[in-house]
């Protein structure tokens, strides 16, 4: 029988390569049974995850899963970093794996490094 616990399906060690100036939607896939949980996004700062209070978010409902979306309109260079979603369910806090955004500044897009280069050399992101 399928578990009725809330589950957050951000893939472990997932990464996204995005351009500053573009719109972007970061999805947190959420599985729940009856009542939709309260879900929030935070951005990692060292070992602390800082809650993103004043950011545009929305829900997208599909047949077997829902998505809690963090909107970047547009992506800014300082959006670079790792994000996590978390859900409150029956007074338990459920945390997702973190997902990392590698933001390339549009000014340097002509010499844009490869995705793999960005993953292995994150200082490229701050040029």
């Amino acid at each position: 029988k399928e578990s009725c616990d809330v589950q957050l399906y951000i893939k472990r060690q997932s990464e996204h390569s995005i351009l500053a100036g573009d719109p972007f939607e970061l999805e947190c896939p959420v599985k729940y049974c009856a009542n939709r949980p309260h879900v929030t996004w935070c951005k990692l700062n060292g070992t602390t995850c800082v809650k993103l209070e004043d950011r545009q978010t929305s829900w997208k409902e599909e047949k077997n899963i829902s998505f809690f979306i963090l909107h970047f309109e547009p992506v800014l260079p300082n959006d670079n970093g790792s994000y996590r979603c978390s859900a409150n369910f029956q007074s338990n806090l459920i945390e997702s794996h973190s997902t990392t955004l590698y933001v390339t500044d549009v000014k340097s897009a002509s010499e844009r490094p490869s995705k793999d280069e960005m993953a292995s050399r994150p200082w490229l992101l701050y040029r």
Epitope: K11, Q13, A119, S120
Partner: antibody, heavy 120, light 112 residues
Amino acid sequence: QVQLQESGPGLVKPSGTLSLTCADSGFNIKDTYIHWVRQPPGKGLEWIGRIDPANGFTRYNPSLKSRVTISSDKSKNQASLKLSSVTAADTAVYYCAREDGYPYYTLDSWGQGTTVTVSS
Amino acid sequence: DIVMTQSPDSLALSLGERATINCKSSQSLLDVDGKTYLNWFQQKPGQPPKRLIYLVSKLDSGVPDRFSGSGSGTDFTLTISSVQAEDVAVYYCWQGTHFPRTFGQGTKLEIK
């Protein structure tokens, strides 16, 4: 049941490009990661790299990175491997494997493997 | 890169004997999420690897309970409590914590 199947030419000329495809008939590839692993004759397993088919983000083995490209086609539910400037040392059985995702994240399903020989 | 070193390279045992294969990683495999992504694979001639154990000690479905895994940090062990003829294979450890992913060099198990 997850079924992965590698396909591609069994013979590649030295300095040419090896091209293989991995078709996944049992799972939506965007929900997981697809890895490529190779095994030279009589030797051990070597991880080549992986792709997140949801967004195309790749990770490669640094020892092969300058020559390897992994891509995916969500509409065909398949991933591809290209290895350029091949030599006899690239002769191996090439496997694709699926990472099983939440909550275990390990290589749970493998293709049968396809043998690629580099020879003129 | 994380180097995975298995020992021994090969072992020959009689049926019913206990097999112990060790795997040592050059760095801790404990991930930020508190899990240790250390896996064991079995490969028989002409076949792809088959996952036996994941997350150090969890047995894959259908794997006989004579197989077990243990360890933490950098030191891991695969144990076969009573070796059977069908266990003849090469066994590999694999780490899924760090990039690049890496395998041990393999341990060949034979029957005396």
